[in-house]
Amino acid sequence: LRHVVYWNSSNPRLLRGDAVVELGLNDYLDIVCPHYEGPGPPEGPETFALYMVDWPGYESCQAEGPRAYKRWVCSLPFGHVQFSEKIQRFTPFSLGFEFLPGETYYYISVPTPESSGQCLRLQVSVCCKERKSESAHPVGSPGES
């Protein structure tokens, strides 16, 4: 399964902090950065860094502690940028994360200083068994940029 999340401030669930996706092992979390055609909004485009954090970091929307890992940067608002996280028990990459069934993982974005963005939050709940590849419902939509 591939779970697509359109990561931008027009996504009310990310903004409210009640967005939860349930993933199984071998699923993918696809994060789609904000994308603008033409000049973009008058307040300027959203740019931010995405972090995997612990519960206190998620609650306070802070990404400064030792358990706050920078994962990706959405800094090209006029390009089509997407990042993928494979939900796997063991990772072959030094920068990859190991996901345990039954655990919840927390993602937040912190706007860059020049950005119009706000704090966005997502919980990823990892379920029990491995799944074959297929697609799933997205969180948000491409129009929410």
């Epitope: 612990d54 519960w55 206190p56 306070s60 400064e64 502690g65 030792p66 920078k70």
Partner: antibody, heavy 120, light 112 residues
């Protein structure tokens, strides 16, 4: 004031288990990580792992996985560490410590330590 | 695991002297989020460690300003500008950037 009060000294036989406690007071127990550290005479300090009482998440030093088990009882604001299959190498003083949040992210308050002696 | 190497092992000083302790890590302590989680603790005989410096150079509350921390990357230093009797004990550096979190071997500050 903030205090971490640890249980008293333990004398245990090789192969046995022991459970030591760390009772917190003076702050909201569920809002701060608790760490456990091992100290052997003349051997410095070794980080065992942490537990977050707010959601019971744990992280262990691989060296202590399967040997140390961290738990909490939020009703009594107490953290526990169980050590199993003990050998003489596990004779040490075990310290609990609270990790403060932003901006420190440091172990700022410590228990007085619990001495564990493994001997037949 | 990240190895934290402290030098010297023992540091004999006269009261009022300046003391300097070095801590080197086997890899950079700059976290992916840009912060450096390097700390200094003092442990006096029969006591638990006390936090002196957090995140390289910040004095913890109640720590006298004669203590200062500096450094970056893999190379860090704790300085005591004028050693007092109450400063004697074992100093440990500690890193929380990489799991497992690790301590230096300690430096014993003693009277010459």
């Amino acid at each position: 004031q903030i205090q971490l009060q640890q249980s008293g000294p333990e004398l245990v036989k090789p192969g046995a288990s022991v459970k030591i406690s760390c009772k917190a007071s003076g702050y909201t127990f569920t809002g701060y990580y608790i760490h456990w550290v091992k100290q052997r005479p003349g051997q410095g300090l070794e980080w065992i792992g942490w537990i977050y009482p707010g959601n019971f998440n744990t992280k262990y030093n691989e060296r202590f996985k399967g040997m140390a088990t961290l738990t909490v009882d939020t009703s009594s604001s107490t953290a526990y560490m169980q050590l199993s299959s003990l050998t003489s190498e596990d004779s040490a003083v075990y310290l609990c410590a609270r990790e403060d949040g932003s901006p420190y992210y440091a172990m700022d308050y410590w228990g007085q330590g619990t001495s564990v002696t493994v001997s037949s | 695991d990240v190895v934290m190497t402290q030098t010297p092992l023992s540091l004999p000083v006269s009261l009022g002297d300046q003391a300097s302790i070095s801590c080197r890590s086997s890899q950079s302590l700059v976290h992916s989020n840009g912060n450096t989680f390097l700390y200094w603790y003092l442990q006096k005989p029969g006591q638990s460690p006390k936090l002196l410096i957090y995140r390289v150079s910040n004095r913890f509350s109640g720590v006298p300003d004669r203590f200062s921390g500096s450094g970056s990357g893999t190379d860090f230093t704790l300085k005591i500008s004028r050693v007092e009797a109450e400063d004697l004990g074992v100093y440990f550096c500690f890193q929380a950037t990489h799991v497992p979190w690790t301590f230096g071997g300690g430096t014993k500050l003693e009277i010459k």
